[in-house]
Amino acid sequence: GSERTCCPVNWVEHERSCYWFSRSGKAWADADNYCRLEDAHLVVVTSWEEQKFVQHHIGPVNTWMGLHDQNGPWKWVDGTDYETGFKNWRPEQPDDWYGHGLGGGEDCAHFTDDGRWNDDVCQRPYRWVCETELDKASQEPPLL
């Protein structure tokens, strides 16, 4: 496969990754699909430095990231280990709150207005951030 050496138009390069910041809202699953359709993934935050970069670009707006616990344990969409990785939850979060009246708990993580993380109902139409790594060989599947 070919390697991507520069970011696509309208994406922002930072530390050998490319980021795309939405200006509209989607449910978490739809945002996840949007990123995958760009051969990318919802942003995976691996450091305080990356947290500050993303926070600078999204401003004080609820924004989905690539972290969820829809199948039990918290997982990053790219397989990055959650337990040993960077975390920036708000105090008392995640709390899997059931009091919202929308059915079920809260299984998807988002940046809040101060940048710290909260778990929320995955159907809420929040903005989102896609990320893809530079120098990653693009996977070309076999033709049928």
């Epitope: 696509p8 309208n10 699909n33 949007y34 995958r36 051969d39 996977q139």
Partner: nanobody, 119 residues
Framework: EVQLLESGGGLVQPGGSLRLSCAAS????????MHWARQAPGKGLEWVSS????????YYADSVKGRFIISRDNSKNTLYLQMNSLRAEDTAVYYC????????????WGQGTLVTVSS
């Protein structure tokens, strides 16, 4: 100039198969997700399927899931739609479409290819 040229349509019996192609030119095909949509006689446009630039990620409307397969060959600048187990309700003009950048809408469409499923 961007051009999308569909081919492969025709008359097929229920349960049969067809493979549609869309030859693309005038843009860097390998950098764009691509899409198939269709319009049945007297009905509105319906999204059918989408594929990421590398072909790794694919998406399907519920109405075609498990029967249609989208694929692409970036070396040939060509998009495909393999249509199996065809039904009368699949009768439509099928269009390939290129998204704008940013992805707000489809900015280029092919002229379409007619698929008729009838016994």
């Amino acid at each position: 100039e961007v051009q999308l040229l569909e081919s492969g349509g025709g008359l097929v019996q229920p349960g049969g198969s067809l493979r549609l192609s869309c030859a693309a030119s005038g843009f860097t095909f390998s950098r764009y997700p691509m899409h198939w949509a269709r319009q049945a006689p007297g009905k509105g446009l319906e999204w059918v399927s989408s594929i990421s630039p590398s072909g790794v990620s694919t998406y399907y409307a519920d109405s075609v899931k498990g029967r249609f397969i989208i694929s692409r060959d970036n070396s040939k600048n060509t998009l495909y739609l393999q249509m199996n187990s065809l039904r009368a309700e699949d009768t439509a003009v099928y269009y390939c479409a290129k998204p704008s950048n940013p992805r707000y809408y489809f900015d280029y469409w092919g002229q379409g290819t007619l698929v008729t499923v009838s016994s």
